[in-house]
Each structure stands twice: as structure tokens, then as C-alpha cells.
């Protein structure tokens, strides 16, 4: 349905508040270094223009595309070349190349200061003084640090952020009320950002077909009672929503997401019995709830898959007639029967099935060739099962911190060229799989663990893509989306790596470590551990454990000393010498 003015159409659909918030998110995700005030000014100008178009859709420039309008606005920023360098060259291009150019310059790791949380009273005063600015600033700070954050979901986070301040700033103990809520929003926000980043990487690096396959598998697990045609419709609509958001078309994305939620709720009888509560909520909560809804129960008495996909004489005929539809049906049927499998495992099985059909349907007797295709699935299923079992046992034995350390050592030995901050961040997140998933029963462990690992390894891939340093990382990241985790798991110690020169400065610590939070202190120690492995990649677990134990004792001792700084200086030298001796550096 063509509209005379796209900007007027979206303004009317979304309402002024959401329109302004989404334009702010879009601008902050594109121009990540621009000051808050500059973005607010641009957003206000766009909003005023949109209002003129609502009043008269035939008014000058109202017929222009959103990319043209927004791009023109971004290109008015005076300091574009000084602040962004070659991104300024995007402004010389015409749409759609200009928008593609902006997208390519999104930075997953922008050089921005860490967000420091002010005192609760300071935050509450700011909230009461100007609620609107306070909430806009939240959107801006999150969007510029997470340029692929799912925009309609960020509106939901902002709503919860506002609710937290509204409630807690009038509580007797403001801090006790507010801080846990802010911690929860921060942790959920990071997880949401990382999950969306994988969706965008899937679409941008592996194409629409890869994303649709992922969506078929996930929605079939979630809605096993829905017909294939229904799941296919949902997949098509969901793909459009995420394509738009990943492409910077945030107004269209939010609008289409709302339409999809409306459709799902109007048709919940043919989709899932678990949607009732979600569908009673307001729009933002409803969309979030649907996205997180638990899997519906599997229909009773589902027939064996073999009948249609192995035993039937029509397998190759059906495959030839519509390859992707037939493979989609296979994936749907397999996934709805296996909520206990990870999505990536289901996609590996579908890929194996496709490869087998490609080979066997070319034969004179295809059935003879593909009759045992399901036997090929067994090792593919057992590999993640065994890996999760082993790692959950290790996690239960070590606890989260030491489990993270084991992974830090493991991954530093696999890809020692990767920067230390990236190795620490990624390994810490990999280690969180233990507390997140190992508590689950067997039937829920694999979908929890392996799909979470896919999200974390994608963080490694996008960070590494910015400054590639390891061919092995590039290979695992680019060859196959669904085989990334097995590819990294299969990497052994990099024998070609030349150990890093020893630098005493890396292992020099000061009294400021004593005032850090437990988490920050862990990161300092884990950073030292990565550096140790980079200096001595052949060090044994026992050697590394001994050095780390000495290091922990050293920090504890000096933090208790009267003259902390002197202790760190003197004892630090002794520790470095002892560590060098222990590791033969």
C-alpha cells in the first residue's frame, strides 16, 4: 500500500513519542560519536518536518524516502569529516548506496567512555528535573554503544527504565530498590544486544535464506502445533522485520513488528496455546513476551519422519519440485519434534539431509543411496551432547570464575593473536553458559547452551572482523554460520604462534585494584592470565594455576597492608621473578 508521504505514514502509525525515540536511536546508531544535544536537535528538526507532512502529504519533500530524508539530515552535521573521517564520503553518494555506506561504518566497538553509574540521588534528581531528557539520554547512550540493538525492543527497555525510576525514586531506600533493577536491565540489555547482533550478522553475512532457516527451526520448536503454512507466514514476516531493523529502517521495523504481534494474537488459536497472557499486555510488553514465550506442547502421536523423508518414493520428486519448500518442511517437522535440540544442530541436520539429497537424487536408485541418511545424524547429535556434558561437569567442579579461567586458557591457546580485552570479554561470556544452562534438565541444556554459544562466538566474530589478526578466527567465522561452534571447538593449540615478548609492565599492579568491584578485580586477574598464556603458550594447567594462586594471594596481602602502594611495588617484583622462574620465561 503506497503512501504519498512515507514519513507522514510512519508518524501517524507510530505516534509522536515512538517516532521521536526511534529516529533518535537510528541517528545515534549511525553517528555514534555525536554529542547528545546535536542528535536531539536533528531529531526535533525531523519531527517538525514530519508534522508538516502529516498536515499536508503533498508538501515539499514529503514524498522523499526515509533514507533520503534521514541521510540528508545526517549529512548536515558540520564536524562529520573531523569526527568520522572516511564516513563523510558516504554523503557524496546517492541512495541507496549512501545508506549502505553508513551501515558499513557502524562500529561494534566504538571508542566511547565506559558508562559510569552516578549516585542514586544524583540520578533521581536528574530524572525528576527533566524526565524526557533523562530517558532520551538513556536511548542515546545504549544505541550509540550498541549500533545493532533491536530498536523496538530498546523502547521496551526504556519503558522499564522509566518505571524503575518512577517507583524507586520515591522509595524509602532508593538504592536498594533501584540498583538491582538497573543491574537486571544492564545484563538483559547486553544479552538482547548480542542476540540481535547474531540475527543481523546472519542476514548480512549469510543472507536471507540462512536467517529464514534459523527462524523456521526456532518457530517450529516454539509453535509445534502450528501448520507449516502458518510457520512459513510468520517466518516471512519476521524476516522482513529483522531485515528492516538490521538495515537501519527502524520506523518500518517497529511498525511491522507491531503488525506481526497483532497478527499472532488474532490467530493464536492456530499458533500456540501459550500466547494468551502475552496477548493481554500493551504493545511493547506484548511483542517482548511473544519473542520470549515458552515452547508449546508437542502434538500427540506425530508420525515418524522417515515415512515422508526417507521411505517415500517421492522424496526426489518433491525435492526437485521445490527444493527450499521441501527442506523447509523437513526442518519444520524435525524441529517441532525436537525442542531438546539446539537450533544450530537442527540446521546442521537439515544441511546434511540437503547434501545427501543433492548426491542421492542424482543417482539411478536414490532410495538405495539415502536410505541410511538418518544414521548420519547420530554423530552430529552426540557431539554437542558430549561437549555440554563434559563442560557442565567441569563447571560444577570449578564454579563460574575458575571455569571462565579454563576457557580463557583454552581460547588463548587456540587463537593467541586475538586482543587480550576481546579474549577476556568473550571467554567470560562463554563461561557464563555454565550458570545459565547447566542447571537445566537434559532436555533443555542443549538449546540453552549451544544457541547461547552461537551468540557469544558471534561477538568474537564481529569484533575480530573490525581488526582481523587470525586466519583461524576468520575461517571459523566465515565458512559456515551453523558450524562456528564446532569449528572453534576443534581448534587445537596454535603451533605457529610466536610467544609474546615478556613485558614486566603488563604484570605491574597498583593499590587501585583494592577499590575495584569483585567483577573488575576478576577482569584484572583474567587479563593477566591471558597475557601469561600469550608469553608462555605451552605452560601447563598446573603451572598456570600455581602462578594465578600466587597472584591472588599477592593481591589479597597487599590490599590488607598499611602501605598498599609500597607492598604492590616490592611484592610485585618478587611475584614477577617467581612467576618467570616457575614458567621458565
Amino acid at each position: 500500500d503506497a503512501h504519498k508521504s512515507e514519513v507522514a505514514h510512519r508518524f501517524k502509525d507510530l505516534g509522536e513519542e515512538n517516532f521521536k525515540a526511534l529516529v533518535l536511536i537510528a541517528f545515534a546508531q549511525y553517528l555514534q560519536q555525536c554529542p547528545f544535544e546535536d542528535h536531539v536537535k536533528l531529531v526535533n528538526e525531523v519531527t517538525e518536518f514530519a508534522k508538516t507532512c502529516v498536515a499536508d502529504e503533498s508538501a515539499e519533500n514529503c514524498d522523499k524516502s526515509l533514507h533520503t530524508l534521514f541521510g540528508d539530515k545526517l549529512c548536515t552535521v558540520a564536524t562529520l569529516r573531523e569526527t568520522y573521517g572516511e564516513m563523510a564520503d558516504c554523503c557524496a553518494k546517492q541512495e541507496p548506496e549512501r545508506n549502505e555506506c553508513f551501515l558499513q561504518h557502524k562500529d561494534d566497538n566504538p571508542n566511547l567512555p565506559r558508562l559510569v553509574r552516578p549516585e542514586v540521588d544524583v540520578m533521581c534528581t536528574a530524572f525528576h528535573d527533566n524526565e524526557e531528557t533523562f530517558l532520551k539520554k538513556y536511548l542515546y547512550e545504549i544505541a550509540r554503544r550498541h549500533p545493532y540493538f533491536y530498536a523496538p525492543e530498546l523502547l521496551f527497555f526504556a519503558k522499564r527504565y522509566k518505571a524503575a525510576f518512577t517507583e524507586c525514586c520515591q522509595a524509602a531506600d532508593k538504592a536498594a530498590c533501584l540498583l538491582p533493577k538497573l543491574d537486571e536491565l544492564r545484563d538483559e540489555g547486553k544479552a538482547s544486544s548480542a542476540k540481535q547482533r547474531l540475527k543481523c550478522a546472519s542476514l548480512q553475512k549469510f543472507g536471507e535464506r540462512a536467517f529464514k532457516a534459523w527462524a523456521v527451526a526456532r518457530l517450529s520448536q516454539r509453535f509445534p502445533k502450528a501448520e507449516f503454512a502458518e510457520v512459513s507466514k510468520l517466518v516471512t514476516d519476521l524476516t522482513k522485520v529483522h531485515t528492516e531493523c538490521c538495515h537501519g529502517d527502524l520506523l518500518e521495523c517497529a511498525d511491522d513488528r507491531a503488525d506481526l504481534a497483532k497478527y499472532i494474537c488474532e490467530n493464536q488459536d492456530s499458533i500456540s496455546s501459550k500466547l494468551k497472557e502475552c496477548c493481554e499486555k500493551p504493545l511493547l510488553e506484548k511483542s517482548h513476551c511473544i519473542a520470549e514465550v515458552e515452547n508449546d506442547e508437542m502434538p500427540a502421536d506425530l508420525p515418524s519422519l522417515a515415512a515422508d523423508f526417507v521411505e517415500s518414493k517421492d522424496v526426489c520428486k518433491n525435492y526437485a519440485e521445490a527444493k527450499d519448500v521441501f527442506l523447509g518442511m523437513f526442518l519444520y517437522e524435525y524441529a517441532r519434534r525436537h525442542p531438546d535440540y539446539s537450533v544450530v544442530l537442527l540446521l546442521r541436520l537439515a544441511k546434511t539431509y540437503e547434501t545427501t539429497l543433492e548426491k542421492c537424487c542424482a543417482a539411478a536408485d536414490p532410495h538405495e543411496c539415502y536410505a541410511k541418511v538418518f544414521d548420519e545424524f547420530k554423530p552430529l547429535v552426540e557431539e554437542p551432547q558430549n561437549l555440554i556434558k563434559q563442560n557442565c561437569e567441569l563447571f560444577e567442579q570449578l564454579g563460574e570464575y575458575k571455569f571462565q579461567n579454563a576457557l580463557l586458557v583454552r581460547y588463548t591457546k587456540k587463537v593467541p593473536q586475538v586482543s587480550t580485552p576481546t579474549l577476556v570479554e568473550v571467554s567470560r561470556n562463554l563461561g557464563k553458559v555454565g550458570s545459565k544452562c547447566c542447571k537445566h534438565p537434559e532436555a533443555k541444556r542443549m538449546p540453552c547452551a549451544e544457541d547461547y554459544l552461537s551468540v557469544v562466538l558471534n561477538q568474537l566474530c564481529v569484533l575480530h572482523e573490525k581488526t582481523p589478526v587470525s586466519d583461524r578466527v576468520t575461517k571459523c567465522c566465515t565458512e559456515s554460520l551453523v558450524n562456528r561452534r564446532p569449528c572453534f571447538s576443534a581448534l587445537e593449540v596454535d603451533e605457529t604462534y610466536v610467544p609474546k615478548e615478556f613485558n614486566a609492565e603488563t604484570f605491574t599492579f597498583h593499590a587501585d585494584i583494592c577499590t575495584l568491584s569483585e567483577k573488575e578485580r576478576q577482569i584484572k586477574k583474567q587479563t593477566a592470565l591471558v597475557e601469561l598464556v600469550k608469553h608462555k603458550p605451552k605452560a601447563t594447567k598446573e603451572q598456570l594455576k600455581a602462578v594465578m594462586d600466587d597472584f591472588a594471594a599477592f593481591v589479597e596481602k597487599c590490599c590488607k597492608a598499611d602501605d598498599k602502594e609500597t607492598c604492590f611495588a616490592e611484592e610485585g617484583k618478587k611475584l614477577v621473578a617467581a612467576s618467570q622462574a616457575a614458567l621458565g620465561l
Epitope: 522424496v315 526426489c316 542424482a362 543417482a363 536414490p366
Partner: nanobody, 115 residues
């Protein structure tokens, strides 16, 4: 959309010969093994012969072995069945299929062997 169009059938005397053709479109013909299937009046479908995608491997039902020859020309997207020493019991509608399917998705071509 997959389309298979058979031709070359007709009335022939016992001992005679016919060459059937099947023109294929709507799928990657050169990637799939193909078969000929026949259905005599009042009977179920019977698989006759199969060929792999490259034309190197051919298979035949015992009833036609030594008399029929299956072949293909991938450049023309066409499947052939050369039928020699025809017998009255070969009378049937012949149709080509993808793989070893016996489902009929085309009209077929009628072969009648009678004196």
C-alpha cells in the same frame, strides 16, 4: 513449476520398436536421476527403468532387460526410452518421473502393442 512432457507413443505391432521422449523443465534436470514408469489399463504403476544424472548408471526392470534402453541428453533437458522387441504386455501409458517416484505428474504417452 516442474513440467514433464512425454511423446513418441503410438500403435506398433509385436516385435516392433518405438522411441519415447520426455522434455523436462522447471527444475535442474541435469542434477536428478530420472525414471520411466508405466501403467497398464486397470493396473497399478510399474517402474520400468532409471538413469543417473550423468547417464552413466542405468537400471532396468527384469521384464524389459535387454529390450529397452534408457538415455538422456542434459543439454536438451530430455530423457529417452528406446523400446525394441515390443510385446503385447508392454501396452501401457508410459510417463517419466524424477528419481524413482511412481507418482504421475504428467499425461504420459500411450503405447499400444497389437497385431
Amino acid at each position: 513449476e516442474v513440467q514433464l512432457l512425454e511423446s513418441g507413443g503410438g500403435l506398433v505391432q509385436p516385435g516392433g520398436s518405438l522411441r519415447l521422449s520426455c522434455a523436462a523443465s522447471g527444475f535442474s534436470f541435469g542434477s536428478f536421476g530420472m525414471s520411466w514408469v508405466r501403467q497398464a489399463p486397470g493396473k497399478g504403476p510399474e517402474w520400468v527403468s532409471a538413469i543417473d544424472s550423468g547417464g552413466a548408471d542405468t537400471r532396468y526392470a527384469e521384464t524389459v532387460k535387454g529390450r529397452f534402453t534408457i538415455s538422456r541428453d542434459n543439454s536438451k533437458n530430455t530423457l529417452y526410452l528406446q523400446m525394441n522387441s515390443l510385446r503385447p504386455e508392454d501396452t501401457a501409458v508410459y510417463y517419466c518421473t524424477i528419481g524413482r517416484s511412481t507418482s504421475r505428474s504428467s499425461q504420459g504417452t500411450l503405447v499400444t502393442v497389437s497385431s
